[in-house]
Amino acid sequence: NTTTTTKSEDGHYARTDYAENANKLEESAREHHIPCPEHYNGFCMHGKCEHSINMQEPSCRCDAGYTGQHCEKKDYSVLYVVPGPVRFQYVGGGSHHHHHH
């Protein structure tokens, strides 16, 4: 189960001066993600930093049991045993992929 959250922040400005930049980037980037630069290892506290080609921003693929923009929160999602015809009910959890704006 993957959730994506987007947070809008000030201080960022789009680089739209040169349209050819965007075209070149899209042409050259066929894969969805490339690794962040190595010095960004600290961007995700409990997870892997990825650079999303489509989103044009860093994102975190959180380790199991963690969530949040920087995988900084413990994920307490659990499997509940529910009486009745439905034996198991899934509540949240899973692999979280958070994008940073």
Epitope: E9, G11, H12, R15, T16, P37, E38, G42, E72
Partner: antibody, heavy 124, light 108 residues
Framework: QVQLVQSGAEVKKPGSSVKVSCKAS????????ISWVRQAPGQGLEWMGG????????NYAQKFQGRVTITADESTSTAYMELSSLRSEDTAVYYC?????????????????WGQGTLVTVSS | EIVLTQSPGTLSLSPGERATLSCRAS???????LAWYQQKPGQAPRLLIY???YRATGIPDRFSGSGSGTDFTLTISRLEPEDFAVYYC?????????FGQGTKVEIK
């Protein structure tokens, strides 16, 4: 507009320490990597290390490992670089720099914003 | 660490001429993580090109970057008086981040 403002020039004795500050304004501070780069007189640029304030994790160039400490205070949007056991070869202009990734159609992790530089002179 | 070697060390040209600056890496560098900076005396460096070929905001189109792998080039198509400065390449995909030693573009 993002601005990085550094502390003033310092004159230090060999063997002592110096702590240079870099205050960010005009944008989000916590999630950007802040680097420290130095430039000795007439020389090129040398990356010392940096930090992502949100995590507090710093990493350093091996040359400076054990002698440099980079920290950040999210509450004041200020990054610090402390260099110890100073020697004359540490005389340089020290810059803080921030990357400039954006939510635009193209992006960069290169150093888009720079402080004005802080001259540190090490002399007996 | 990745060593970046720039050539030539100094380039003596006249305004209006074309400048070609080279940056060679000791091992392959991702094109996503190669930048060029301009620095004038007494000033902080200024980002010109990132991702090997993308101009930073506000940079005139006479500046262009190209290359891949271990060989990268910064070209200034027609030198203006304000372009005479020192130029540095930088790789920022691998830690430690490294810079080339610089190329000085001076007036002939």
């Amino acid at each position: 507009q993002v601005q990085l403002v550094q502390s003033g020039a310092e004159v230090k004795k060999p063997g002592s320490s110096v702590k240079v500050s870099c205050k960010a304004s005009g944008g989000t501070f916590s999630s950007y990597y802040i680097s420290w780069v130095r430039q000795a007189p007439g020389q090129g640029l040398e990356w010392m290390g940096g930090i992502i304030p949100i995590s507090g994790r710093a990493n350093y160039a091996q040359k400076f490992q054990g002698r440099v400490t980079i920290t950040a205070d999210e509450s004041t949007s200020t990054a610090y670089m402390e260099l110890s056991s100073l020697r004359s070869e540490d005389t340089a202009v020290y810059y803080c720099a921030r990357d400039g990734y954006s939510s635009g159609r193209s992006t960069t992790y290169a150093f888009d914003y720079w402080g004005q530089g802080t001259l540190v002179t090490v002399s007996s | 660490e990745i060593v970046l070697t720039q050539s030539p060390g100094t380039l003596s040209l006249s305004p209006g001429e074309r400048a070609t600056l080279s940056c060679r890496a000791s091992q392959s560098v991702s094109t996503y993580y190669l930048a060029w900076y301009q620095q004038k005396p007494g000033q902080a460096p200024r980002l010109l090109i990132y991702g090997a070929s993308y101009r930073a905001t506000g940079i005139p189109d006479r500046f262009s970057g190209s290359g891949s792998g271990t060989d990268f080039t910064l070209t200034i198509s027609r030198l203006e008086p304000e372009d005479f400065a020192v130029y540095y390449c930088q790789q920022y995909g691998h830690s430690p981040i490294t810079f080339g030693q610089g190329t000085k573009v001076e007036i002939k």
